[in-house]
């Protein structure tokens, strides 16, 4: 099956202090390689979450990524701050035998728009 990374929401709005879910699903787990979430693109992009076991404060996976055939790589960001605003990308990599992993597909991106906390 052809690999497609889908981020169904173009944008989400969230009040500062609240949490938000960023959805991402894959049509295939092949080729073998990790899935990572970034904010921004190019040289300035920031790694937000990696489904490879590291700990990321305030960011958690929504479903159990270790489950066999799990295609859901959505994440939850808690206690959102204005600094979290930006466009988030779910990116699939192909594992390299010795060289670094190769980025092969990305979702279309989901903008996180942070609203002022209601007073």
């Amino acid at each position: 099956k052809e690999l497609k990374v889908t981020q169904p929401e173009k944008s989400v709005s969230v009040a500062a202090g609240d949490s938000t879910v960023l959805n991402c699903t894959l049509t295939s787990l092949l080729p073998v390689g990790p899935i990572k979430w970034y904010r921004g693109v190019g040289q300035s992009r920031l790694l937000i979450y990696s489904f490879t076991g590291e700990h990321f404060p305030r960011v958690t996976n929504v479903s159990d990524a270790t489950k066999r055939n799990n295609m859901d790589f959505s994440i939850r960001i808690s206690n959102v701050t204005p600094e979290d605003a930006g466009t988030y990308y779910c990116v699939k990599f192909q594992k390299g035998p010795s060289e670094p992993d190769t980025e092969i597909q990305s979702g279309g991106g989901t903008e996180v728009y942070v609203l002022a906390k209601p007073s």
Partner: antibody
């Protein structure tokens, strides 16, 4: 049939204001994000601003930030662009554009309205 | 922001000929790219989205290809109504949404 009809263009002096309108029909207006795109004489297309269907999410190009305000009235199926502190470089045809529901490209455009800023 | 560069700036061809327009991005936009046609006095029209999908009602002489940083719009056999200006637009890196500078297809 989708129709977008812009109005409100005209000739103004630098520093003055103008409000553009875009009357939409043929689709469920409140369900779609809407944009303003402009084209200066002899130049290419430049994205100006976008507003989400609910009006909650708004973005501007750096060139107009702090001077232009996008808004919408879903009960009237109308998109607006309030343009303050106009400059000569704002002279352009302003197009209203309906976004696709999946991604941020434009599946329908209006004919545009010409704004001329001249002393 | 992602910069799109279109080439050539002007393409002079005769009706019936094949037109090949190029759009290059300064960083990968995967296949998140659209093409538009703009004729004088008319609203811009969406031709291609997702780099290669034809929009509703667009004749099959228009086709798009490419991914990453290099994209092509091909018009297989130019008709009189195809002489116009063509723009590419990326919707991956946003905001802002960015357009290429345009390619004018004119009658030779």
């Amino acid at each position: 049939d989708v129709q977008l009809v812009e109005s409100g263009g005209g000739v103004v002096r630098p520093g003055e204001s103008l409000r553009l309108s875009c009357a939409a029909s043929g689709f469920t207006f409140s369900s779609y994000d809407m944009n303003w795109v402009r084209q200066a004489p002899g130049e290419g297309l430049e994205w100006v601003s976008l507003i989400s269907g609910s009006g909650e999410i708004i973005y501007y190009a750096d060139s107009v930030k702090g001077r232009f305000t996008i808004s919408r009235d879903n009960s009237k199926n109308t998109l607006y662009l309030q343009m303050n502190s106009l400059r000569a470089e704002d002279t352009a045809v302003y197009y209203c554009a309906k976004e696709n529901n999946r991604y941020r490209f434009f599946d329908y455009w209006g004919l545009g309205t010409l704004v001329t800023v001249s002393s | 922001k992602t910069v799109l560069t279109q080439s050539p700036g002007t393409l002079s061809l005769s009706p019936g000929e094949r037109a090949t327009l190029t759009c290059r991005a300064d960083q990968s936009v995967y296949t998140y790219l659209a093409w538009y046609q703009e004729r004088p006095g008319q609203a811009p029209r969406l031709l291609i989205y997702d780099a290669s999908s034809r929009a509703t009602g667009i004749p099959d002489r228009f086709s798009g290809s490419g991914s990453g940083t290099e994209f092509t719009l091909t018009i297989s056999s130019l008709q009189s109504e195809d002489f116009a200006v063509y723009y590419c637009q990326q919707y991956y890196d946003r905001p802002p949404l960015t357009f290429g500078g345009g390619t004018k297809v004119e009658i030779k």
